[in-house]
Interface confidence: medium
């Protein structure tokens, strides 16, 4: 009969750092022997080989030595794959391909997950608050995967959707730190709750803050944007937040929304006559049409480039009108510095050497700091140059000229002033005579 390969329909969910089993089974015919079996596990999209069994033998892992079959169960038709120490990068579809005389395959999805920490809450300003004051409440939760869903609500459980800015930044392991900012005009008093949900684990992490201001509210309808610049990494998408307070009975037919570059007044995107007029900015912008009626005039800017940096004006007119400008700050992390030494052999105390620290493709221009092994800054005889490429990203080369002591460690720190990201490199020169790199 025909060979049938079966895998679970639902994704296999695995916590980062644990082991996962990707189930796959087939129905062996009577008289089947493992010598007849050719089993291939591969990544569905890239077709990268993961593990295989052929000619009656396990051919081993081709995937970072973290996979294994269940050899004692193969003859019964169990072709499952064990994946050890699961990483975020493992997420995706794995194809189990079984051939004997006939053949078949099926793909199983691996969904990686990591729980988020209990959120911490901060308030700015955090004293002398009065009704009508605008406050910024920040909710931060760490080391989760996949990206979280963040929900804000007031003391009555009513969702707060306007003026929320959520950023999620992945670390080297692919785990996300979530920072969600709620800007709110204070009422007489209020409780504000933040819930960070892991959509895969259905795990909720909660925190709340209660604010009791000093007197009754005052305030006016206005167009609101974040005070702080929106920071966006090159190549990612950015949301330029803008909101207005629609009056009762407001309809989109009444709205005229214009986004433009503040300085040049170049049109970026518009909405008029109840219709999105589209992007006038390299087809990389979009509104949130379903949210406009609630007063959300935010703009999505896709595939951010260095050249996008600057001020964008959100202009809203209904019967009255208003506008506000939001700044976009573009950033790109610097690479880990590479260190070179000249001369790099037969070095002796008293020799003058040139140590070059190079870091690439960052933005904006870096701050470069040198220090010795004791952490003492080295400021003399440092020359730093930064050259922008066609995309506007900077390559940094910093040269330190130093007279060698008996031994010494020289560290270079390249700081991205916007991301507050530090990239370090160091070189240790010891012995007499000395060479670089040190010989094994």
């Amino acid at each position: 009969g025909a060979l049938e390969v079966q895998v679970p329909e639902d994704p296999v969910v695995a916590l980062v750092g644990t082991d996962a089993t990707l189930c796959c089974s087939f129905s062996p015919e009577p008289g089947f022997s493992l010598a007849q079996l050719n089993l291939i596990w591969q990544l569905t999209d890239t077709k990268q080989l993961v593990h295989s069994f052929a000619e009656g033998q396990d051919q081993g892992s081709a995937y970072a030595n973290r996979t294994a079959l269940f050899p004692d169960l193969l003859a019964q038709g169990n072709a499952s794959l064990r994946l050890q120490r699961v990483r975020v990068a493992d997420e995706g579809s794995f194809t189990c391909f079984v051939s004997i005389r006939d053949f078949g395959s099926a793909a199983v999805s691996l969904q990686v997950a990591a729980p988020y920490s209990k959120p911490s809450m901060t308030l700015e300003p955090n004293k002398d608050l009065r009704p009508g004051d605008t406050v910024t409440i920040t909710c931060s939760s760490y080391q989760g995967y996949p990206e979280a869903e963040v929900f804000w609500q007031d003391g009555q459980g009513v969702p707060l959707t306007g003026n929320v800015t959520t950023s999620q930044m992945a670390n080297e392991q692919g785990l996300f730190d979530v920072h969600s900012i709620l800007r709110v005009v204070l009422g007489a008093n209020g409780t504000y709750s933040c819930l960070v949900r892991n959509p895969v684990l259905q795990q909720d992490a909660h925190s709340s803050v209660t604010i009791t201001p000093q007197r009754s509210p005052t305030g006016a309808v206005e167009v609101q944007v974040p005070e702080d610049p929106v920071v966006a990494l090159v190549g990612t998408d950015a949301t330029l937040r803008c909101s207005f307070s629609p009056e009762p009975g407001f309809s989109l037919a009444q709205l005229n929304l214009i986004w433009q570059l503040t300085d040049t007044k170049q049109l970026v995107h518009s909405f008029t006559e109840g219709r999105d007029q589209g992007s006038a900015y390299a087809n990389r912008t979009a509104l949130f049409p379903d949210l406009l009626a609630q007063g959300n005039a935010s703009l999505r800017l896709q595939r951010v480039r260095v050249a996008d940096e600057g001020s964008f004006t959100c202009f809203v007119s209904i019967r009255d009108f208003g506008s506000a400008a939001v700044s976009l700050q573009v950033a790109a992390p610097y690479s880990k510095p590479s260190m070179t030494l000249e001369p790099n052999k037969d070095l002796r105390p008293g020799d003058t050497v040139t140590i070059t620290c190079s870091s690439y493709r960052g933005y904006p221009e870096a701050e470069v700091f040198w220090q010795d092994g004791q952490g003492v800054p080295l400021t003399g005889n440092v020359t730093t140059s930064q050259m922008a490429n066609e995309q506007g990203l900077f390559d940094v080369h910093s040269v330190l000229r130093v007279v060698l002591g008996a031994n010494g460690t020289y560290s270079c720190l390249v700081r991205n002033p916007v991301l507050q990201q530090d990239a370090h490199g160091s070189v240790t020169i010891t012995g007499q005579p000395m060479t670089f790199p040190p010989e094994a």
Epitope: L37, N38, L49, F97, R101, F103, S105
Partner: antibody, heavy 120, light 107 residues
Framework: QVQLQQSGGGLVQPGGSLKLSSCAAS????????MSWVRQTPDKRLELVAT????????YYSDSVKGRFTISRDNAKNTLYLQMSSLKSEDTAMYYC????????????WGQGTTLTVSS | DIVMTQSPSSLSASLGDRVTISCRAS?????LNWYQQKPDGTVKLLIY???RLHSGVPSRFSGSGSGTDYSLTISNLEQEDIATYFC??????????FGGGTKLEIK
């Protein structure tokens, strides 16, 4: 003995469609084997166009035909089919059906071939 | 997809000669098969999994190789061996790929 008898083919205009051939199988348990369509272009190169497993649950296509060609089988009739649409001149070829043998991934029996010409 | 490089593209030999055709690819783990196509278009499997003779194929045909380099040898060329020969890799999933062919003629 194993036999694969092809029919179909012919002349089709660019952009046109054709349910090329059927391939009628005999001499073996049809539903137990994968089947394939292999074509030979005028420059005599062979290209595996599409493959289907025994119960029809898995299909595979070359990038050059993906989205345009559909391989199917009727195990009750012991017949293999290839539906072709949006035909291009580069689809002009001799089309062979072949039995695909599993674990070593070879084609152990071939049909006699049928010619498809895509031309205006 | 894996690219199969077959050589030579054509070759002329005398009856009784020993003939060798080569096929090169990335590492295909011995999943290399050889086919014969007669001038009338008929295609037959000769060898599968590098060196295993398909049933009914004369023993003068043999295959060898490993890793990236494989070859088909006809030890004692006969008139009926006049044909074009193709290699094919069966590594990983379909679509499997063929070499460009070697046309064998009699001197």
């Amino acid at each position: 003995q194993v036999q694969l008898q092809q029919s179909g083919g012919g002349l089709v205009q660019p952009g046109g469609s054709l349910k090329l051939s059927s391939c009628a199988a005999s001499g073996f348990t049809f539903s137990s084997y994968g089947m394939s369509w292999v074509r030979q272009t005028p420059d005599k190169r062979l290209e595996l166009v599409a493959t289907i497993n025994g119960n029809g649950g898995n299909t595979y296509y070359s990038d050059s035909v993906k989205g345009r060609f559909t391989i199917s089988r009727d195990n009750a009739k012991n017949t293999l089919y290839l539906q072709m649409s949006s035909l291009k001149s580069e689809d002009t070829a001799m089309y062979y059906c072949a039995r695909s043998y599993g674990n070593y991934h070879y084609f152990d029996y071939w049909g006699q071939g049928t010619t498809l010409t895509v031309s205006s | 997809d894996i690219v199969m490089t077959q050589s030579p593209s054509s070759l002329s030999a005398s009856l009784g000669d020993r003939v060798t055709i080569s096929c090169r690819a990335s590492d295909i783990r011995n999943y290399l098969n050889w086919y014969q196509q007669k001038p009338d278009g008929t295609v037959k499997l000769l060898i599968y999994y590098t060196s295993r003779l398909h049933s009914g194929v004369p023993s003068r045909f043999s295959g060898s190789g490993s890793g990236t380099d494989y070859s088909l040898t006809i030890s004692n060329l006969e008139q009926e061996d006049i044909a074009t020969y193709f290699c094919q890799q069966g590594n990983t999933l379909p679509p499997w790929t063929f070499g460009g062919g070697t046309k064998l003629e009699i001197k």
